[in-house]
Interface confidence: low
């Protein structure tokens, strides 16, 4: 999905006002310390595509972060201030549904959901032009 | 008003290094990402690498590798590039620029460095 | 490196002519390209970002459109302090790059 049609600053506000509270609140208990970022992403739309990866996109270690609130959320966010982008995930929701229940939190995924949280942060001090 | 302004004209003997600066004005320094970009005489434009003031995070145009550093002070709102082991071939116009998405909305006036013996 | 092919690499054209340039990618860079406009002595203006959207202060005469691998660049009306040298850029990925540049001079 190309996200440069998307409206940022909505996403950042939806950010702000809540998936960001539940993305802490997935790492409570966890420094931001403990892991280093080692995903970047280069502008707005690239951090989208980074972030949207990381969320959806299940990893050997860390299956089902898709089935989180903050992802969930995410989702939402996505769905309604990017043209188009519901239509695109029909498919990738199908795919889901296939996915195991997470028994634990990992610290795989706690380390990709500190990853998570890097990318949005940087997503939005590339908006900070805007305040 | 947004300004990039570059440091004056350099002559450089073959071998020698140059240190090219941009002040930023107008906007939050940390905020962009600052570029340089390479325009030898007559030519086109050519992406050196670009800096990120706020956590001093580079990338390079692997061409450029060895030959570019990038600086920033962030205290003065000023970038750097110095360039070494200089030759004719980097005989060029050098304009940093920034960017919030990969496309370079402000740039400065640009820096001829010449190189000759 | 993603390759950026422009054409033609001159033109001559008329006050009022409707010119139009193409820039190509060598793979899929999705809308992340911009268009320059450069003219001698000078820096490079920014005038078009994420392939059709226009800078601020651009004249609506300039014009972006394409998208995956294949742009343009359509000034609509020839001004005469339109003679002057465009560039493309994407801006999908590191490192960015730009196309060789347009030359459209006075016919």
């Known amino acids: 999905y190309d996200f440069t049609n998307c409206d940022f600053q909505k996403i950042e506000a939806d950010y702000l006002r809540t998936i960001s509270k539940d993305l802490i609140t997935y790492m409570s208990g966890t420094k931001s310390t403990d892991f280093n970022n080692t995903v970047s992403c280069s502008n707005r739309p690239h951090c989208l595509t980074e972030i949207q990866s990381l969320t959806f996109n299940p990893t050997p270690r860390c299956a089902s972060l898709a089935k989180e609130m903050f992802a969930r959320k995410t989702k939402a966010t996505l769905a309604l201030w990017c043209p188009g982008y519901s239509e695109t995930q029909i498919n990738a929701t199908q795919a889901m549904k296939k996915r195991r229940k997470r028994k634990v939190t990992t610290n795989k995924c706690l380390e990709q959901v500190s990853q998570l949280l890097g990318l949005w942060r940087r997503f939005i001090r590339t908006l900070l032009k805007k305040q | 008003q947004v300004q990039l302004v570059q440091s004056g004209a350099e002559v450089k003997k073959p071998g020698a290094s140059v240190k090219v600066s941009c002040k930023a004005s107008?906007?939050?320094?940390?905020?962009?990402?600052m570029h340089w970009v390479k325009q030898a005489p007559g030519q086109g434009l050519e992406w050196i690498g670009v800096?990120?003031?706020?956590?001093?995070?580079?990338t390079y145009n692997q061409k450029f590798k060895g030959k570019a550093t990038l600086t920033v002070d962030t205290s003065t709102s000023t970038a750097y590039m110095e360039l070494s082991s200089l030759r004719s071939e980097d005989t060029a116009v050098y304009y940093c620029?920034?960017?919030?998405?990969?496309?370079?909305?402000?740039w400065g006036q640009g820096t001829l460095v010449t190189v000759s013996s | 490196d993603i390759q950026m092919t422009q054409s033609p690499s001159s033109l001559s054209a008329s006050v009022g002519d409707r010119v139009t340039i193409t820039c190509r990618a060598s793979?899929?860079?999705?809308?992340?390209l911009a268009w320059y406009q450069q003219k001698p002595g000078k820096s490079p203006k920014l005038l078009v970002y994420?392939?059709?959207t226009l800078a601020a202060g651009v004249p609506s005469r300039f014009s972006g459109s394409g998208s995956g691998t294949d742009f343009t660049l359509t000034i609509s009306s020839l001004q005469p302090e339109d003679f002057a040298t465009y560039y493309c850029?994407?801006?999908?990925?590191?490192?960015?790059?730009f196309g060789q540049g347009t030359k459209v001079e006075i016919k």
């Open positions: 800096i990120d003031p706020y956590d001093t995070d580079t």
């Open positions: 620029t920034r960017s919030l998405d990969g496309f370079f909305d402000y």
């Open positions: 793979e899929n860079i999705y809308s992340y």
């Open positions: 994420f392939a059709k």
């Open positions: 850029q994407h801006h999908y990925d590191t490192p960015w790059t």
């Open positions: 107008g906007y939050t320094f940390t905020s962009y990402w």
